[in-house]
Amino acid sequence: MMTGTIETTGNISAEKGGSIILQCHLSSTTAQVTQVAWEQQDQLLAICNADLGWHISPSFKDRVAPGPGLGLTLQSLTVNDTGEYFCIYHTYPDGTYTGRIFLEVLESSVAEHGARFQIP
């Protein structure tokens, strides 16, 4: 029985040209996390395997930095980065847990005035 829950940063906004940390946390389970995959719609961004380290997709390698922890730092944001991001936790023995984050990338002036969860 899968008892765990994924906590995410939920809906976040960030400024065009800036950076954002995508972060999920798995709680309420003793299952072992074997790896975490980060995906945007149908595109793989990165995989962090507990033993084998990081794999970063070539299309993102210049703009994605591993970490902190199992999270992912997305840099040099563009408006095209707006959309859904998924953290997919592969665990043993529970199986797979998926968390969702919605990122909105805003023009600088908009982001500077009252955007929630803004990352400077």
């Epitope: 074997t34 790896q35 995959a37 995906e39 149908d42 595109q43 793989l44 995989i47 395997n49 507990a50 033993d51 084998l52 380290g53 990081w54 794999h55 970063i56 997709s57 070539p58 299309s59 390698k61 591993p66 592969h90």
Partner: antibody, heavy 119, light 107 residues
Framework: EVQLQQSGPELVKPGASVKISCKTS????????MHWVKQSHGKNLEWIGG????????SYNQKFKGRATLTVDKSSSTAYMELRSLTSDDSAVYYC????????????WGQGTSVTVSS | DIVMTQSHKFMSTSVGDRVNITCKAS??????VAWYQQKPGQSPKLLIY???YRYTGVPDRFTGSGSGTDFTFTISSVQAEDLAVYHC?????????FGGGTKLEIK
């Protein structure tokens, strides 16, 4: 130039063990994981497992867990795979292979070590 | 474990032909797929990584495509030196698994 040089062919008896080495050169050994792949009958490839030379962390295919042990010697930039309790099904060519930088695809391979299990 | 199925064990083609080799994953692997070429008596060589990226020095007649469960490796104009076995591999989740291989034969 990156090179992975494996030890020579082995003829071993059923029930025995074999330890294959993979000596590396041309790159910083601790910055890349090292993997081992079995090829039976000249065709099918099977991933045995991988090791992180930096911290000794290992990931095994459950099929080989308990019989295969992956180790490294950082001082000589050499990776090892030991396979125990051998049977005729273990007769195969074994490769060490190194993935790329932040990429799991294996871009450098050793020349292979042939292991024959026969009484 | 994820099963990678290459439906054709053998494919026969002529020099200059276009050939597609397919690989199907038993569950989604996003774009975490590589293609290797193995010539007789040699080690596998990486041709395509992350489903569609050509490895350094690989001729542009070799291409890869696909996402999720269905992947295709294409040789746009087969050359005599392309006689080999071609393997797909998923590295989305351990244990990393390979397809059974497709042997390309030149008529």
């Amino acid at each position: 130039e990156v090179q992975l040089q494996q030890s020579g062919p082995e003829l071993v008896k059923p029930g025995a063990s074999v330890k294959i080495s993979c000596k590396t050169s041309g790159y910083t050994f601790t910055e890349y994981t090292m993997h081992w792949v079995k090829q039976s009958h000249g065709k099918n490839l099977e991933w045995i497992g991988g090791i992180n030379p930096n911290n000794g962390g290992t990931s095994y295919n459950q099929k080989f867990k308990g019989r295969a042990t992956l180790t490294v010697d950082k001082s000589s930039s050499t990776a090892y795979m030991e396979l125990r309790s051998l049977t005729s099904d273990d007769s195969a060519v074994y490769y060490c292979a190194r993935p790329g930088w932040y990429n799991y695809a294996m871009d450098y391979w050793g020349q292979g070590t042939s292991v024959t299990v026969s009484s | 474990d994820i099963v990678m199925t290459q439906s054709h064990k053998f494919m026969s083609t002529s020099v200059g032909d276009r050939v597609n080799i397919t690989c199907k994953a038993s569950q989604g692997v996003s774009t975490a797929v590589a293609w290797y070429q193995q010539k007789p008596g040699q080690s596998p060589k990486l041709l395509i990584y992350s489903a569609s990226y050509r490895y350094t020095g690989v001729p542009d007649r070799f291409t890869g495509s696909g996402s999720g469960t269905d992947f295709t490796f294409t040789i746009s104009s087969v050359q005599a030196e392309d006689l080999a076995v071609y393997h797909c591999q998923q590295h989305y989740i351990t244990p990393w698994t390979f397809g059974g291989g497709t042997k390309l034969e030149i008529k």
